[in-house]
């Protein structure tokens, strides 16, 4: 602890000027004081002043006014410090002395002579607060008040309790009177050093060093941090704890990115065809007679299918065809014929057979000829075989189709997919995405690849239902369920006509 | 107990970047009472203080060195990191990390056994 | 920038009492702290918040801090008492050491 003692003397009075032992000074009594702060005492004796000793210059002759004077000698009010806790009781002398030396330093002066002395015993709280008090004997009076207050930084009842104001990372605060910390605006803690962070701030998502601050644990965002951040990449879906993708209503695959209900949200399918939420690229269109194309959206020539027999050569017309038949012929599609056998209507070598009594025949073509005189070479790409765009290309006998980027086959009917470089490692299933593919990872397995072998296996607690297969590797800690044909779902809980093994991520 | 233990390279090249690292173990790094300091001392000189971390990743660094000094914490391996870059031969120092307590007032009350850095080509 | 002064040496004869005195502007309004440091040893705190002693540190380590000053008073020293002995302070969020005193044990 630490505090000072504090005595104001304001007036001592001496009218005859006499010493204690009746004599009087000689001019007058040159009068300076000896303070002596022990502990408290019944009765007071002699000894060491324990809580110590103070002594004035000359402060007056024989009856004075002691004036406050703050600094050098003389200084009232007089000041005993002391470095220990205030026990709340003492023991007072004030000695008046008259000396015949120096104003100064009279202490040191031979020849010093007693004029009065006084004791106070007693109880005395630390305060702010002078306690007044005048003593008389038969000669002298002395009026006085006295008082015990901290030093800076020490607190309390007896001055024990150290508290320095501070402003800084081990502690924002003032000193209450009682020496306790009163924390500065924005700051809590025992000791004033925690941050009082943005109203609102989630307890466990978010933090702050400084006041009015919310700082986002990794997986949040948002002001409060209390929105979670969905797994990177995921378009249609969201998310209820950090790096998930759950999929919003008809959308599937790992990022929610394959449209499962394209048909409907986007019509692409033309010109009355129907259209699928299924196929490679989400949807199929099943075009209605005399249309073709990806969407049905090319119109077919009336012409395409070659109505015309017998050599007839077809012309298109608005909403039909014509068919101008070669001489010999006739009828809508010139099928009827007004030659025989005798008129050698076989070309190419066909062999012509009479029929219905030899008024009409039928010609046997030889092979790549046809048509009802063996007219024409047989064009094996009439029938369009080739499908995704594919050109067709008659070589000999035989015909080729040549495929579009992407696809593959004899009639370009296998779409060629990223997954068969087979990019997955230890058994992981291949999804082929816009983006490229993406690996769905059996358990114990995790990365871009299912290259990472992980200690955790997600799928361990069988999180799956509905007969689906769990797979690890989308992130950390996370599993996949691929879903069997009717259910859906981050664990394929929901039974649901959708279509089947789409993945959906936990 | 807690311990402390600075490691990293002994020598460092002028111009380069000096890095250590200072384990903590017998206590949590994340603990809301104390921050981590490091301090260092020129042979035959006195301590430098160079800067300290809060497991949240709060910063405040000796205003002589706050343009080349960087200290980080990975509370998951309880260790905090040191980079001083641009070193000349006047960084050659014994640097310890230490433990600094708020409730004592910012004493350190556990510290490092050091490690001499030597810059030098 | 804050700093604080020492005397660079201060000699006792075994069983003496030794002040070491730590000088910085406004000081005392500051909490200031101890540290020993033996000759290829670390620092160890033997004075926090001016005067508390941590639990291990011998009684006759003691200290004070008012007006400018802070004081270390090791009461009757002794041989194994020889060593540095260094002053800290914060400055706002600046740790400041004092330059050090050499303690020796006549």
């Known amino acids: 602890g630490s505090g000072i003692f504090q005595l104001r003397l304001q007036e001592f009075v001496n009218q005859r000027g006499m010493l204690a032992n009746g004599q009087s000074c000689e001019p007058g009594c040159r009068t300076f004081f000896r303070i002596c702060l022990k502990h408290f005492q019944a009765t007071f004796s002699e000894g060491p002043c324990t809580f110590g000793n103070v002594s004035t210059p000359v402060l007056g002759t024989n009856s004075f006014v002691v004036r406050d004077k703050n600094s050098g000698s003389g200084r009232n009010p007089l000041q005993l410090p002391f470095n220990f806790t205030w026990p709340g009781t003492f023991s007072l002398n004030i000695q008046a002395w008259h000396t015949p030396g120096d104003d100064l330093r009279p202490e040191t002066s031979p020849g010093n002579s007693l004029i009065s002395q006084i004791i106070i015993q007693g109880s005395l709280a630390v305060g702010k607060i002078w306690r007044t008090d005048e003593q008389n004997d038969t000669l002298t009076r002395l009026s006085y008040s006295y008082r015990v207050i901290c030093s800076d930084n020490y607190y309390g009842e007896s001055c024990s309790r150290l508290c320095k104001k501070r402003d800084d990372h081990f502690g924002h605060y003032e000193c209450q009177p009682d020496g306790s910390l009163s924390c500065l605006p924005g700051w809590t803690g025992k000791y004033c050093d925690q941050p009082i962070c943005l109203s609102g701030c989630h307890e466990q998502n978010g933090y702050c060093s400084k006041p009015d601050e919310c700082i986002c644990r990794p997986g949040w965002q948002g002001r409060l941090c209390n929105e979670c951040i969905p797994h990177n990449g995921c378009r249609h879906g969201t998310c209820s704890i950090p790096w998930q993708c759950a999929c919003d209503e008809g959308w599937g695959g790992l990022f929610c990115d394959q449209d499962l209900n394209y048909c409907t949200h986007h019509s692409p399918c033309k010109n009355g065809s129907t259209c699928s939420n299924s196929g490679p690229k989400g949807y199929t269109c099943t075009c209605l007679p005399g249309y073709t194309g990806e969407h049905c959206e090319l119109g077919l020539s009336k012409c395409a299918s070659n109505p015309c027999r017998n050599g007839g050569s077809c012309k298109d017309q608005e909403n039909s065809y014509h068919c101008l038949c070669p001489p010999g012929y006739y009828g809508q599609h010139c099928e009827h014929s007004t030659l025989t056998c005798a008129d050698s209507p076989c070309f190419n070598g066909g062999s012509c057979r009479e029929r219905n009594q030899g008024s009409s025949y039928a010609c046997e073509c030889p092979p790549n000829f046809t048509g009802s005189n063996c007219e024409k070479k047989v064009d094996r790409c009439t029938s369009n075989p080739c499908a995704n765009g594919g050109q067709c290309q008659n070589r000999g006998p035989s015909r080729t189709c040549r495929c579009r980027p992407g696809f593959t086959g004899t009639h370009c009917e296998l779409h060629i997919s990223d997954c068969a470089r087979s990019p997955c490692a230890h058994g992981g299933t291949c999804h082929d995405l816009e983006n490229g593919p993406v690996c769905t990872c059996p358990a114990g397995f995790s990365g871009r690849r299912c290259e990472v072998r992980i200690t955790h296996d997600a799928c361990a607690s069988g999180p799956c239902f509905n007969g689906a297969t769990c797979y690890t590797g989308l992130s950390p800690n996370n599993f996949v369920c691929n879903c069997p044909y009717g259910f859906v779902g981050s664990r394929c809980e929901f039974p649901v006509g959708l279509p089947p093994s789409f993945p959906w991520v936990a | 107990e807690v311990q402390l233990q600075e490691s990293g390279p002994g020598l460092v090249k002028p111009s380069e970047t000096l890095s250590l690292t200072c384990t903590v173990s017998?206590?949590?790094?994340?603990?809301?009472?104390?921050?981590w300091g490091w301090i260092r001392q020129p042979p035959g000189k006195g301590l430098e203080w160079i800067g300290d971390?809060?497991?949240?990743?709060?910063?405040y660094y000796n205003p002589s060195l706050k343009s080349r000094v960087t200290i980080s914490v990975d509370t998951s391996k309880n260790q905090f990191s040191l980079k001083l870059s641009s070193v000349t031969a006047a960084d050659t120092a014994v640097y310890y990390c230490?433990?600094?307590?708020?409730?004592?007032?910012?004493?350190?009350?556990?510290w490092g056994q050091g490690t001499l850095v030597t810059v030098s080509s | 920038s804050y700093e604080l002064t020492q005397p660079p040496s201060v000699s006792v004869s075994p069983g003496q009492t030794a002040s070491i005195t730590c000088s910085g502007q406004?000081?005392?309004?500051?909490?200031a702290s101890w540290y020993q440091q033996k000759p290829g040893q670390s620092p160890v705190l033997v004075i926090y918040?001016?005067?508390k002693r941590p639990s291990g540190i011998p009684e006759r380590f003691s200290g004070s801090n008012s007006g400018d000053t802070a004081t270390l008073t090791i009461s009757g020293t002794q041989p194994m008492d020889e060593a540095d002995y260094y002053c800290?302070?914060?400055?706002?969020?600046?740790?400041?050491f004092g330059y050090g005193t050499k303690v020796t044990v006549l």
């Open positions: 230490a433990r600094e307590a708020v409730p004592l007032g910012g004493g350190s009350d556990y």
């Open positions: 017998g206590g949590s790094i994340s603990s809301s009472s104390y921050y």
């Open positions: 971390i809060y497991y949240t990743g709060s910063t």
């Open positions: 406004r000081l005392g309004d500051k909490y």
């Open positions: 918040e001016d005067s």
């Open positions: 800290q302070a914060w400055d706002r969020d600046t740790g400041v």
